[in-house]
Interface confidence: medium
Amino acid sequence: LSTSKTIDMELVKRKRIEAIRGQILSKLRLASPPSQGEVPPGPLPEAVLALYNSTRDRVAGESAEPEPEPEADYYAKEVTRVLMVETHNEIYDKFKQSTHSIYMFFNTSELREAVPEPVLLSRAELRLLRLKLKVEQHVELYQKYSNNSWRYLSNRLLAPSDSPEWLSFDVTGVVRQWLSRGGEIEGFRLSAHCSCDSRDNTLQVDINGFTTGRRGDLATIHGMNRPFLLLMATPLERAQHLQSSRHRAALDTNYCFSSTEKNCCVRQLYIDFRKDLGWKWIHEPKGYHANFCLGPCPYIWSLDTQYSKVLALYNQHNPGASAAPCCVPQALEPLPIVYYVGRKPKVEQLSNMIVRSCKCS
Amino acid sequence: LSTSKTIDMELVKRKRIEAIRGQILSKLRLASPPSQGEVPPGPLPEAVLALYNSTRDRVAGESAEPEPEPEADYYAKEVTRVLMVETHNEIYDKFKQSTHSIYMFFNTSELREAVPEPVLLSRAELRLLRLKLKVEQHVELYQKYSNNSWRYLSNRLLAPSDSPEWLSFDVTGVVRQWLSRGGEIEGFRLSAHCSCDSRDNTLQVDINGFTTGRRGDLATIHGMNRPFLLLMATPLERAQHLQSSRHRAALDTNYCFSSTEKNCCVRQLYIDFRKDLGWKWIHEPKGYHANFCLGPCPYIWSLDTQYSKVLALYNQHNPGASAAPCCVPQALEPLPIVYYVGRKPKVEQLSNMIVRSCKCS
């Protein structure tokens, strides 16, 4: 919005709320809110909440989503989690225990159940819970390849820490490969980094879910915290609607919320799903800070304006040198939601839902 | 711009051109075009053109700039190049020739001359010219640390190739450290990747600028192509203007330029600095494809509209659920320019100058 007329803030808020109503339904490809007749009483199952929290953590870790997104990424992603095959499985016997590596295997039938087609996969993350670490450790991730060779994927420098911390590796390409192939069990190896000079490196980092003499069988104690793949994929029934490529993208709230800025700024708006939209079908969260952009972006350049006066205003009011600058979102963040389809709870992430800052564009 | 009235395209273009006039001056923090009184006759010096081309290559390699940028990044960056200390320098004698590593040292006084304060450094890239490569090679980059130890920085998987190719490593943090410290010579090591299992890796890749029996002394033949640091920094005199953080960000042209789309789309606009702005002070390029966004973004949601009809339009016309969607740039690309300050030619990069695509926001 870019107007210097007196603005009816309430009208703008109502328009934004109604736009969000359409946005959420559109992202979920629903023509109307889903029926709640099949939803069982009581709280959400633990496993669903754990999944929702994983998704929320991912958002917190990443903050804004600066990357532009193809049309496929506009639509909500179904989030699923596939746990590592437990360490007592015979597959682990083939790989000798070593001081510098640990192995993680996954059942591809579980992956295929979650993501029936490779093209539907939007993102796959390998999540490992790192327990406390006494020394800095440089680790490398490898993918199991044909004839038991290993292919390097990525590395991470882990800082010493007294508290556990989730590690996340983007393994989208690898998981897409696995979904395309016929294998039953696929896996990763996490190794200490060895340089060509120093080759005596030991893997010092403890990853939850692996039996060691030092800790006892944490795999049993914390089964849900053993390594897992966090998958985000377009549900099969939504896939046929997707076309080739149309994009979207965008970035702060501290200044605007604490000032009386009249020009373009992010304005506070909390959407309560029940109160504002009359919706009861979204089980988590109860609402979210959607916010919106408002305020004029004066066109500040003309031949008869004194150059020096306007230059300082450029960065703020018309950084993109638009012919008619407009106050629009810059940083947008996603929103994970939990809702039911029939009796089945679903966790889905809606992209670009929360406006963190605005810009004149 | 978001309007469904008949649009005077020429007026919009003129407004955009005048806005660009201000934008460029503003990014350079100039109140008016710089005096050309001291500019010597004749073409630009070779070294300046080489630097300009390096900057252009960087842009081409990166394409769009998806990352949001703090205010500091809004302003033009001065681009400089610091060549590696030549291999016959005694510093190289301290590091034994090895089959798995090559060493690259830099004179920090040259770095400090280019970037007087660490905080001014915006980006530093280590550029290496890889000659033809027969086999896939996994390489690692290390930074020389105190007491001649080496700290791992990053890695790259190099595909076999018959033609030379520039490799670029982001070493901004490292160079910032070097600028903060008192050392005279600092360096990098490029090594073959050795895993803890296979330790017989040889560095197969040939980097231009290193003498080997196989190639003769290419350091002498191609001096300017030996490894270098490409630095982008805020000039000292511009630094005091910078405040904390205010951002900007955004993405395609193929569809719009080849269609008759009436709605929001990127429109073609080439700016010739001389013809359109009456400017002769920008020596390179002669002009650029600025483009601009134009076309309506209908507000497509209201309580009395049938839900199902509007859902399909959401992604296109109001993906951000704005109360008044607006046609704005999505992907923006930077523009390197060459101009004189007194007798001194400068290469600077202006961020977010080229509109590659638009979106309703």
Epitope: - | Q36, V39, P41, P43, Y340
Partner: antibody
Framework: EVQLLESGGGLVQPGGSLRLSCAAS????????MTWVRQAPGKGLEWVSA????????YFADSVKGRFTISRDNSKNTLYLQMNSLRAEDTAVYYC????????????WGQGTLVTVSS | DIQLTQSPSSLSASVGDRVTITCRAS??????LNWYQQKPGKAPKLLIY???NLQSGVPSRFSGSGSGTDFTLTISSLQPEDFATYYC?????????FGGGTKVEIK
Amino acid sequence: EVQLLESGGGLVQPGGSLRLSCAASGFTFADYAMTWVRQAPGKGLEWVSAISGSGAATYFADSVKGRFTISRDNSKNTLYLQMNSLRAEDTAVYYCARVSSGHWDFDYWGQGTLVTVSS
Amino acid sequence: DIQLTQSPSSLSASVGDRVTITCRASQSISSYLNWYQQKPGKAPKLLIYAASNLQSGVPSRFSGSGSGTDFTLTISSLQPEDFATYYCQQTYTVPLTFGGGTKVEIK
């Protein structure tokens, strides 16, 4: 409006000296390099000399090098050409012109002043 | 020094004619070439700078092209006020040099 007005021309004997002036107005004089171009009667244009905006850099044609000096007084918005050891072949209309940019095109010219070297 | 050779040295044409004047440099000068018009008893006037850029206020019937060593000045439809002498100038290196000129006369 940009204006350039040359003065100081006239008749001089071979070996003599002459100082040409060019008074500039209508623009920020110090922001522009300036140049002198001459034209012998019935002949084409010949570039003589040029000077940068501050006066720090000067340029000369080989035919006048060592004999002519170019200077400027930015406080007076004036360009000068001091001509010594004049020869018959220096006879020409002398124009001062403004150098418009780093491309060195001459966008504004004075009306010229005639210098005749003859005994 | 860089020599500029203009051709023809003179030409006769009628009002409305399309006129082309060429300028050849003794070595490559990129696009460092300007064109000037001079009428008898007057100072030269800049028409085209940097080989192909029309100077402000100059009619659009004038155009310049070329790069390297070969350049062209074209008057698309000759007008009575266009009868004059035209000079090319290189600014690639010092000494700056002018071509010998092309006199456009009324046929």
